[in-house]
């Protein structure tokens, strides 16, 4: 099974998985809600951007991000499948030149502006691992997914595959 | 390289349950969600469900109080049941693995070469 | 559940010729349509995903676009064993749905 965690045995190659060309292969403009239908909104607070987790009021409109997906190859002897995979990798804009980026070593997730080429820190695995719900794995760190702590997002560690549909990690799309 | 392989029982009572196994090779299923699709005679294309790497699963709407998908992913081994079976359920089963790793959004670009289910007394 | 029309059921064409089929979504898809290639007694085989995308191996006179809820799928300068039938798929929500088919037909 997931042993070594799946997620691990398949992405401990996420550090050197070659990302497709440098173009996204479609991107998409939708708003971000958690699996118990909480918005992530971002506010800009003293000319930095803060993400927050909230039910939003009746005619509150939902903020829109913009997700860019990109084909990642992976190479056979490190998925320890018997040929190379495809993986699909996300990065997500909420403004111009804002990307969520993983800070591993505060176990946070922030928005930073940068500029293209974008930092691996940026990039996330996509899986939907739940019916109609997706997470995002770090690239940078195989194994800690985006999640929901304190009403805040952060980088949360999943060591087996049945904590893959834990609902913190699970995030739903959509474009209304 | 990347196998599924289906086997069945060819021929099922009507009222009577099946079960299928689509036995996979050349990757693992901790890493793939697989999907099962039917294919009935002179009609189209039908997506009866999907089981995901991580072990859930999805199911045609219609079909859903009659369907389970389950795996074991020791034995590379994925399995079909479905129960109180008649004459419209008469099709060529299939199953088939997604093209990116632990996600659907894809489709599959492998395929078993089915099995057929004729549903008769 | 998402609805797939495909259309047309059924289209005539000679070698050589460009056909199109369409697919309508009864609410936005983004861009995650598949469409399938099924020839008699054969498994089916993806052709494009992702709405664009060119599966491995697949000629370059097969192309898809669109993306929401209108999706195309043109085949180009048509060869002999490319008059079967085509499917196309959402996988944007589950159930993921197939559209109804398209049978090519030589003229």
């Known amino acids: 099974a997931f042993g070594i965690s799946g997620v691990q045995k398949y992405t401990r190659a996420l550090h050197d998985s070659s990302i497709t060309g440098i173009s996204p292969i479609t991107e998409y403009l939708a708003s971000l809600s958690t699996y118990n239908d909480q918005s992530i909104t971002f506010a800009l607070e003293d000319e930095s951007y803060e993400i927050y987790v909230e039910d939003l009021k009746k005619d509150e409109k939902k903020d829109k991000v913009l997700l860019s997906y990109y084909e990642s190859q992976h190479p056979s002897n490190e998925s320890g499948d018997g040929v190379d995979g495809k993986m699909l990798m996300v990065t997500l804009s909420p403004t111009k030149d804002f990307w969520l980026h993983a800070n591993n070593k505060e176990h946070s997730v922030e928005l930073h502006k940068c500029e293209k080429p974008l930092p691996d820190q940026a990039f996330f695995v996509l899986h939907n691992m739940h019916s109609n719900c997706v997470s995002f794995e770090c690239k940078t760190d195989p194994g800690v997914f985006i999640g929901v702590k304190d009403n805040h997002l952060a980088l949360i560690k999943v060591d087996s595959s049945e904590n893959l549909c834990t609902e913190n990690i699970l995030f739903k799309l959509s474009e209304t | 390289q990347v196998q599924l392989k289906e086997s069945g029982p060819g021929l099922v009572a009507p009222s009577q349950s099946l079960s299928i196994t689509c036995t996979v090779s050349?990757?693992?299923?901790?890493?793939?969600?697989v999907h099962w699709v039917r294919l009935p005679p002179g009609k189209g294309l039908e997506w009866l469900g999907v089981?995901?790497?991580?072990?859930?699963?999805d199911y045609n709407s219609a079909l859903m109080s009659r369907l389970n998908i389950r795996k074991d992913n020791s034995k590379s081994q994925v399995f079909l049941e479905m129960n109180s079976l008649q004459t419209a359920d008469t099709a060529m089963y299939y199953c088939?693995?997604?093209?990116?790793?632990?996600?659907?959004?894809?489709?599959?670009?492998?395929w078993g070469q089915g099995t057929l289910v004729t549903v008769s007394a | 559940d998402i609805q797939m029309t495909q259309s047309p059921a059924s289209q005539s064409a000679s070698l050589g010729e460009s056909v199109t089929i369409t697919c309508l979504a009864s609410?936005?898809?983004?861009?995650?349509l598949a469409w399938y290639q099924q020839k008699p007694g054969k498994s089916p085989q993806l052709l494009i995903y992702a709405a664009t995308r060119l599966a491995d191996g697949v000629p370059s006179r097969f192309s898809g676009s669109g993306s929401g809820t209108e999706f195309s799928f043109k085949i180009s300068s048509l060869q002999a064993e490319d008059f079967v039938i085509y499917y196309c798929q959402q996988l944007y929500n589950t159930p993921y749905t197939f559209g109804g088919g398209t049978k090519l037909e030589i003229k």
């Open positions: 609410q936005t898809i983004a861009t995650w």
């Open positions: 050349g990757f693992s299923l901790t890493n793939y969600g």
């Open positions: 088939a693995r997604d093209h990116y790793f632990s996600n659907s959004y894809g489709g599959s670009p492998y």
């Open positions: 089981i995901r790497a991580g072990g859930s699963s």
